[in-house]
């Protein structure tokens, strides 16, 4: 009675192919003959699953990175089968938006390239989709802006699809730096004020970074000795009547408002004295 280890041991995947991430995978450890009889089985990678009985291994919720598995049938000796590749298919992983250019801050007018990166995908054939606020922008791995404007600012996402599924990046915020624009002078309580009261002129603007320096000018283009966003005239005099404009400066540049006219009218007392 010649004793020998199990012969022609094979690891067999019972599932229909392809296997997808998350599937339950059943493998059996088969052999041709053995003397004495097989009493136990071993599996590699070791300890990854509970010890299976009857030469059948069930992997619940198989991971994308479960690559190869091998079994051994054991009597007094263990005979190892050649490893089998699970070849688990999965949706693209680790999708992210990466800015290629410019290197740092995006300034108005810059040409800008965003890249949709992912670490791996199986199968490898993928499609890309770019969206902003739910609107489809493109189907390439790169999203390019020839000349970016402040209106392009917002939240962008890219999606990478393969036959298994699709994966979205985290939303990526595109911010554009630009000089002050859309400046206007607003007047409170209004553009017609009675002498002796107070009038407040406010320089309103849209800028990124915010305006850090304001300059006020009168109808003669004379700069006034005020450098804050609000110009308060109190008490206001008839001589203050005229057109005013403001200039806003941030670290990108300057912007100026159109003229706004303030009319200061005489009070009843002044008219009565005349």
């Amino acid at each position: 009675d010649v004793q020998y280890p199990p012969k022609k041991v094979t690891t067999v995947i019972q599932n229909p192919m392809p296997i997808r991430e998350g599937d339950t995978v059943t493998l059996s450890c088969n052999y041709n003959s053995s003397n004495p009889s097989v009493t136990r089985y071993e599996w590699k990678p070791h300890g990854a699953w509970e010890e299976p009985s009857l030469g059948v291994l069930k992997i619940q919720n198989v991971g994308w990175d479960n690559t190869t598995i091998a079994c051994a049938a054991c009597n007094s000796w263990c005979s190892w089968a050649s490893p089998v590749a699970l070849n688990v298919q999965y949706a693209p992983r680790d999708v992210r938006v990466r800015k290629i250019k410019p290197l740092s801050e995006i300034h108005s007018g810059n040409s800008v390239s965003l890249q949709c990166d992912f670490s791996s995908s199986h199968p490898k054939e993928v499609q890309f989709f770019w969206e902003k606020n739910g609107r489809l922008l493109g189907k390439e791995s790169q999203l390019n802006f020839d000349s970016i404007s402040p209106e392009d600012a917002g939240s962008y996402s890219c999606w990478v699809n393969n036959s298994i599924g699709q994966t979205a990046s985290k939303a990526w915020t595109l911010e554009v730096l630009y000089a002050p624009r859309r400046l206007r002078v607003s007047m409170s309580p209004g553009d017609q004020v009675m002498e002796g009261k107070s009038a407040t002129l406010t320089c309103e603007s849209d800028a990124n970074p915010p305006v850090s320096h304001y300059t006020w000018f009168d109808w003669n283009n004379q700069s006034l000795p005020y450098h804050s966003q609000k110009l308060r005239l109190e008490p206001v005099k008839v001589q203050h009547s005229g057109a005013y404009w403001c200039q806003g400066t941030n670290s990108v540049g300057k912007g100026r408002s159109p003229l706004s006219t303030l009319t200061v009218y005489y009070s009843p007392e002044t008219i009565g004295r005349r």
Epitope: H107, G109, S111, S147, P209, P210, N250
Partner: antibody
Framework: QVQLKESGPGLVAPSQSLSITCTVS????????VSWVRQPPGKGLEWLGV???????NYHSALISRLSISKDNSKSQVFLKLNSLHTDDTATYYC???????WGQGTTLIVSS | DIKMTQSPSSMNASLGERVTITCKAS??????LSWFQQKPGKSPKILIY???RLIDGVPSRFSGSGSGQDYSLTISSLEYEDMGIYYC?????????FGAGTKLELK
């Protein structure tokens, strides 16, 4: 890839003017700003001004009366002109994209009689 | 103009050491701050912008933090090639201003 190269006179007498050219390759000056920064020998960096893609400029207030920046998009060149030079304008002058994404190697200016 | 006070002005550190350089702005600059590295005889190189965003290709041992007026650059484990002078640049308020620099040398 993006490259910048400054070229200047090297030595200039006090009260004279300085002209430096920055030649840019690898991107369009229609789309990017070019800043000028200087560094006196053994000292730190000082931002001088910038010209943007649309041609608008922004100058350091301390130099606004002496400094002008212009460009020729077709030649991919940016020009710095600094008037009424003093000895403390002696420095290495750099051009850079936007606010420092890419830098030239610098050109050294000595103001001396 | 905004004054950027950078400290220390120079420091000696050992390889593998954690190094922190700080910049304090004379007023709030809203995180509009970059860090540059300059090696002797070379032009500056940008490392970080908007206080904490690492430039692509810059080693992950560099990190930036801060807000308001106070900012810092940290090198988690110093390497030989990190020797040089480091500058902060504020671009939140016109005109742009640099810190005076921190010279980092090997102990």
């Amino acid at each position: 890839q993006v490259q910048l190269k400054e070229s200047g006179p090297g030595l200039v007498a006090p009260s004279q003017s300085l002209s430096i050219t920055c030649t840019v390759s690898g991107l369009s000056l229609n789309n990017y700003g070019v800043s000028w920064v200087r560094q006196p020998p053994g000292k730190g960096l000082e931002w001088l001004g910038v010209i943007w893609g649309d041609g608008s400029t922004n100058y350091h207030s301390a130099l606004i009366s002496r400094l002008s920046i212009s460009k020729d998009n077709s030649k991919s060149q940016v020009f710095l002109k600094l008037n009424s030079l003093h000895t403390d304008d002696t420095a290495t002058y750099y051009c850079a994209i936007n606010w420092g994404d890419y830098w030239g190697q610098g050109t050294t200016l000595i103001v001396s009689s | 103009d905004i004054k950027m006070t950078q400290s220390p002005s120079s420091m000696n550190a050992s390889l593998g050491e954690r190094v922190t350089i700080t910049c304090k702005a004379s007023q709030d600059i809203n995180s509009y701050l970059s860090w540059f590295q300059q090696k002797p005889g070379k032009s500056p190189k940008i490392l970080i912008y908007r206080a904490n965003r690492l430039i692509d290709g810059v080693p992950s041992r560099f990190s930036g933090s801060g807000s308001g007026q106070d900012y810092s650059l940290t090198i988690s484990s110093l390497e030989y090639e990190d020797m040089g002078i480091y500058y902060c640049l504020q671009y939140g308020v016109f005109p742009l201003t640099f810190g005076a620099g921190t010279k980092l040398e090997l102990k």
